[in-house]
């Protein structure tokens, strides 16, 4: 019961986590610029992995997608890749874990198969969570370093002058969503791995044969039959259950000091 609960909870936690990773990846608020007063009105800038937005105090909002793939910083591309890998792994993990759930019966799937699938999905969730946490952390590091905004400078560009305005970008809501979601996915994955240990069958899958001490003149033949030694009268090869070789499926064997395994 505890195993089923652990597995189910792990699945739900991972599901919430992956939904959060997807939400964070799609959100526009990865970096935000604090409200500043310009000659017109308060303008609020914020950016995501895919587009940049401006919102005015009047409520007007405009977003534009990043114009080129090649012109984007390598770090931004890396963050995108990490988040997408996290989503893909998480989605596959969810698919695998659905079939691995103990409460769901699919054909004659053995517990060992469910255990393996639970472990697989658990590992996928862990990697997915780590990808999301890494992606968000790399982006956060980009914001902290502020490498492009160290000084406000003016220079002459094509067709006029360009001035870089000193600005400070802060962590957007998406970063916190990503960190929390990544953490939840990671925790869910760990729970699935723990559940896997409980699902794995204690006994081995093959039929173990225990050899019990019997009469001094008894020879063993596979299949649990006593062979006649000339003294007995078992000429019809009747199966004998009182001390010969027995499979564990045939009889419950109670240990004694004479048992050899």
């Amino acid at each position: 019961m505890a195993v089923t609960a652990c597995q189910g909870l792990g699945f739900v936690v991972s599901l919430i986590g992956i939904a959060g990773i997807i939400a964070a990846t799609c959100m526009d608020q990865w970096s935000t610029q604090d409200l500043y007063n310009n000659p017109v009105t308060a303008v609020f800038n914020y950016q995501g992995l895919w587009r940049s937005c401006v919102r005015e105090s009047s409520g007007f909002t405009e977003c534009r997608g990043y114009f080129t793939l090649l012109g984007l910083p390598a770090m931004l591309q890396a963050v995108r890749a990490l988040m997408i890998v996290g989503i893909v792994l998480g989605a596959i993990g969810l698919l695998v874990s659905i079939f691995a759930l103990k409460c769901i019966r699919i054909g004659s799937m053995e517990d060992s198969a469910k255990a393996n699938m639970t472990l697989t999905s658990g590992i996928m969730f862990i990697v997915s969570g780590l990808c999301a946490i890494a992606g968000v952390s790399v982006f956060a590091n980009m914001l902290v370093t502020n490498f492009w905004m160290s000084t406000a400078n003016m220079y002459t560009g094509m067709g006029g002058m360009v001035q870089t305005v000193q600005t400070r970008y802060t962590f957007g809501a998406a970063l916190f969503v990503g960190w929390v979601a990544g953490g939840l996915t990671l925790i869910g994955g760990v729970m699935m791995c723990i559940a896997c240990r409980g699902l794995a069958p204690e006994e081995t899958n093959y039929k173990a044969v225990s050899y019990h001490a019997s009469g001094h003149s008894v020879a063993y033949k596979p299949g649990g039959f006593k062979a006649s030694t000339g003294f007995g009268s078992n000429t019809k090869n009747k199966k004998i259950y009182d001390g010969g070789a027995r499979t564990e499926d045939e009889v419950q064997s109670y240990p004694s000091k004479h048992d050899y395994v």
Partner: nanobody
């Protein structure tokens, strides 16, 4: 790279009108606001008018009645309709865009090369 192309300047008699236009092209992301500045001979560059993408306008004190700023968001173009021009309006008029590139390059102010407006009889 962002380019600003201004047009519409010229010589006009006092009381006359002119319409300046400025189109931005290139890799433009979030435009915070666009507008016009002017610099008269021997003077500092001063704000004429600005407009946000949402249409909020701002004018330099006494210009509001005579000058009208407007923008076309689809074309990334800003216009300045100047009516009842006076000799003191003679200056080089510079188109202005403030564009936010965020993580791609911060906040940048762009000025055009300027277009000469001369008010003389």
């Amino acid at each position: 790279q962002v380019q600003l192309a201004e047009s519409g300047g010229g010589l006009v008699q006092p009381g006359g009108s002119l319409r300046l236009s400025c189109a931005a092209s290139g890799n433009i992301l979030s435009i915070n606001y666009m507008g016009w500045y002017r610099q008269a001979p021997g003077k500092e560059r001063e704000l004429v008018a600005t407009i946000t993408r949402g249409g909020t306008t701002n004018y330099q004190g006494d210009l509001k009645g005579r000058f009208i700023i407007s923008g076309d968001n689809t074309k990334d173009t800003v216009y300045l309709q100047m009516n009842n021009l006076q000799p003191e309006d003679t200056a080089v008029y510079y188109c202005y865009f403030r564009i936010n590139f965020g993580i791609l390059g911060g906040l940048r102010d762009y000025w055009g090369q300027g277009t000469q407006v001369t008010v003389s009889s």
